[in-house]
Interface confidence: medium
């Protein structure tokens, strides 16, 4: 399943309440062609990987998560262990998304 | 068509260096991790280590550690397999390969490295 | 690391004949690859995420298992099966087995 982010107040909740688990973020627009191209691999991903947490957050709608974590282009991908940032890559790429989250989980 | 080509045979006398090369088509290089795997004659497959020809960061099988020097040139689209000090024990066929988690996955055709005095 | 111990390490089977193969992780996996090799070539990736098999891998070979036991079983032998076969796991350190090497009676 994958979380739906709303507010900087939510995403720093779902960071801190992953504990040891890794998280990984998808940050993404409505308008952004390649993101809704790889939004259903991100979530066939989240029931692959029932031990990691998938949140979605939204750029426009959280411009301030998107600022905070230094986003510039859609879609961009962060992997997070205990609050701190531990990967990140940019662009729909689906085998780069798998592999990463198996090196990190 | 995704292929991978590796450069040809090396026959490198003890103590010496090699640089393999893998040049991909068909893809580019930066949208993927790139992985080597060791065999060596009439043995099973190791796994050496990959890159990240994107931001050039690696990681290694730790017992291939300081032995293997994996590097990437985006603009050729090439990766490279150094092996340093070699010995006997290094003799084998080398290959890069793209390991993807769908379907298809590439292989390069192996490049055969001999050490011998 | 996670070590991936294959049985038999040899055998051989008559054309019709029924083949399983195991694969035994030191640690939980959550997905099993298996490749098929023949002499003086690349290995071919020959079965992924557990069960599915590759473009062009015939029918009457299936992939099965979960935690630390897998498997890869031939429902009838045929003599271009003749190979061995590898299984490997891709957690943050890939591993592979030793093969099992399937010969022709």
């Known amino acids: 399943m994958v979380k739906q982010i709303e507010s900087k107040t939510a995403f720093q909740e779902a960071l801190d309440a992953a504990g040891d688990k890794l998280v990984v973020v998808d940050f993404s627009a409505t308008w952004c062609g390649p993101c809704k191209m790889i939004k259903p691999f991100f979530h066939s991903l989240s029931e692959k990987y029932s031990n990691v947490i998938f949140l979605e957050v939204d750029v426009d709608d959280c411009q301030d998560v998107a600022s905070e974590c230094e986003v510039k282009c859609m879609p961009t991908f962060q992997f997070f262990k205990k609050g701190q940032k531990v990967g990140e890559f940019s662009g729909a790429n689906k085998e780069k998304l798998e592999a990463t989250i198996n090196e990190l989980v | 068509e995704v292929q991978l080509q590796q450069s040809g045979a090396e026959l490198v006398k003890p103590g010496a260096s090699v640089k393999l090369s893998c040049t991909a088509s068909?893809?580019?290089?930066?949208?993927?991790?790139m992985h080597w795997v060791k065999q060596r004659p009439e043995q099973g497959l190791e796994w050496i280590g990959r890159?990240?020809?994107?931001?050039?960061?690696?990681k290694y099988d730790p017992k291939f550690q300081g032995k293997a020097t994996i590097t990437a040139d985006t603009s050729s689209n090439t990766a490279y397999l150094q092996l340093s000090s070699l010995t006997s024990e290094d003799t084998a066929v080398y290959y890069c390969?793209?390991?993807?988690?769908?379907?298809?996955?590439?292989w390069g055709q192996g490049t055969s490295v001999t050490v011998s005095s | 690391q996670i070590v991936l111990t294959q049985s038999p390490a040899i055998m051989s089977a008559s054309p019709g004949e029924k083949v399983t193969m195991t694969c035994s992780a030191s640690?939980?996996?959550?997905?099993m690859y298996w490749y098929q090799q023949k002499p003086g070539t690349s290995p071919k990736r020959w079965i992924y995420?557990?069960?599915k098999l590759a473009s062009g891998v015939p029918a009457r070979f299936s992939g099965s298992g979960s935690g630390t036991s897998y498997s890869l079983t031939i429902s009838t032998m045929e003599a271009e099966d003749a190979a061995t076969y590898y299984c490997?796991?891709?957690?943050?350190?890939?591993?592979f087995g030793a093969g099992t090497k399937l010969e022709l009676k």
């Open positions: 390969a793209l390991l993807q988690y769908s379907a298809m996955d590439y």
């Open positions: 068909g893809f580019n290089i930066k949208d993927t991790f």
């Open positions: 890159i990240d020809p994107a931001n050039g960061n690696t």
């Open positions: 640690s939980r996996i959550s997905y």
């Open positions: 995420d557990t069960s």
């Open positions: 490997h796991q891709r957690s943050s350190y890939p591993t």
